[in-house]
Interface confidence: medium
């Protein structure tokens, strides 16, 4: 079958190879579309609500005034020429929209290196077939599931027009030390082939890189934090600041109902006390000032400590000293 | 830079309501756990509320039912509803959150007084 591409909306004619240019013609066209169950015959003789949906021309072709999506299908014609020869003609009719130029909406202006970021959504409306959404970064494609790169995609279809609306929300982690003004596009690729790409206009987001504050030092003795049970862990908050804040202890978040103190000591390590600690100094000049966390972890006889460790409950027997 | 602002603290009487607001700039907002902390005069500090990244809120148990945590990713903004306070209420309300590497983020504070 010869492949036919047809926009929607727009005509089509399909000729009947081997018909007699004028009538009398001996030529039966035969459908399989959405339109029809199996298979719909037409004569060049026509008449009936078909008409306004496809008919045959004088000359033996098939006309159909607009074609739409349930036009799609095989479309034959047989015919007879006056010397009694049979010819067949034989179409596969596929039908296409382009959308709109696709955009990109809910774009972020800034992005903050070393975390997920949405960088924004792509949207496509009015396509059909669906075709496809990607993502390009300074003009590269970019490939989801890679270096931080995730997207979540979804395809909606309209009711009434059978059309589809095409979503892309990209997401990225910035590297640390990268672009600071990088350039991301989104473009539609139809369905069909031949027809070419439509790109967004680029959206060009600032990269924030975060500062870590240096000011609150948190040392931990034994270094990594790692312990075996029964053990002693000695964790002092180190302030620059002069006079001297306040120190408050915080366990996976939740400050620890102790007096204020630069030292907290964990005696006789339990697997209550495991969990993520930070200090915190209160200043009456600004708002309090956290050091980074660290993860306090038991290691059974003949583990190797961690650096890191794991989340655990409240602790108990916790010493602040002041 | 990572800036929290808070803001909607001042006097109100027992029984009143306040909604505290803590604005973040420098950041992407929605995909951080957040959470108001409060510390009153000469006692220590102390956890009020948490919200985690998919938006499950915690509370404190001398809070729970008076105190609602609620955050606008739109607008970057956390909030704290406050209702039926109490003169124990009264304290500088921070809000806490937690960037990239592991490092935390305070605002500058807002006091809240109940009074009669």
């Known amino acids: 079958a010869q492949n036919i591409t047809a926009r929607i909306g727009e005509p089509l004619v399909l000729k009947c190879k081997g018909a007699p240019k004028k009538p009398p013609q001996r030529l039966e066209w035969k459908l399989n579309t959405g339109r029809t169950e199996a298979w719909k015959v037409l004569s060049p003789q026509g008449g009936g609500p078909w008409d306004s949906v496809a008919r045959v021309l004088p000359n033996g072709s098939l006309f159909l005034p607009a074609v739409g999506i349930q036009d799609e299908g095989i479309f034959r014609c047989q015919a007879m020429n006056r010397n009694g020869k049979e010819t067949k003609s034989n179409y596969r009719v596929r039908v296409y929209q382009i959308p709109g130029k696709p955009e990109i909406v809910d774009s972020a202006s800034e992005l903050t290196a070393g975390v997920p970021n949405k960088v924004g959504t792509c949207v496509s409306e009015g396509s059909y077939p669906a075709g496809t959404l990607s993502w390009h970064l300074d003009g590269k494609p970019l490939v989801p599931n890679e270096k931080g790169v995730s997207v979540k995609e979804q395809t909606r279809r309209h009711p009434e027009t059978g059309l589809f609306t095409l979503q892309s929300e990209l997401m990225v982690t910035p590297a640390r030390g990268g672009d600071p003004r990088p350039t991301f596009s989104c473009s539609f690729s139809p369905g069909l082939p031949r027809h070419r790409a439509l790109r967004t206009a680029p959206i060009q987001p600032r990269v924030w890189e975060p500062v870590p504050l240096e000011e609150v030092q948190l040392v931990v003795e034994p270094e990594g934090g790692a312990v075996a049970p029964g053990g002693t862990v000695t964790l002092t908050c180190e302030v620059p600041a002069q006079p001297s804040p306040q120190i408050h202890w915080m366990k996976d978040g939740v400050p620890l109902p102790l007096p204020p103190s630069p030292v907290l000591i964990l005696p006789e390590i339990g697997p209550q006390d495991q969990g993520t600690y930070s200090c915190v100094a209160t200043h009456s000049s600004h708002g309090p000032q956290e050091s980074r966390a660290v993860s306090i972890s038991i290691i059974e006889p003949g583990e190797e400590g961690p650096t890191a460790g794991s989340v655990g409950g409240s602790g108990l027997g916790t010493l602040a000293l002041a | 830079e990572v800036q929290l602002v808070e803001s909607g603290g001042g006097l109100v009487q027992p029984g009143g309501s306040l909604r505290l607001s803590c604005a973040a700039s420098g950041t992407i907002f929605s995909l951080n756990p957040m959470g108001w902390y409060r510390q009153a005069p000469g006692k220590q500090l102390e956890l009020v509320a948490l919200?985690?990244?998919?938006?499950?809120?915690n509370y404190a148990d001398f809070v729970r039912g008076r105190f609602t945590i609620s955050r606008d990713t739109t607008k970057k903004t956390l909030y704290l509803q406050m209702n039926s306070l109490e003169p124990e209420d009264t304290a500088v309300y921070y809000c806490?959150?937690?960037?990239?590497?592991?490092?935390?983020?305070w605002g500058q504070g807002t006091q809240v007084t109940v009074s009669s």
């Open positions: 806490r959150s937690t960037f990239a590497a592991g490092n935390f983020y």
């Open positions: 919200i985690s990244d998919s938006g499950t809120a």
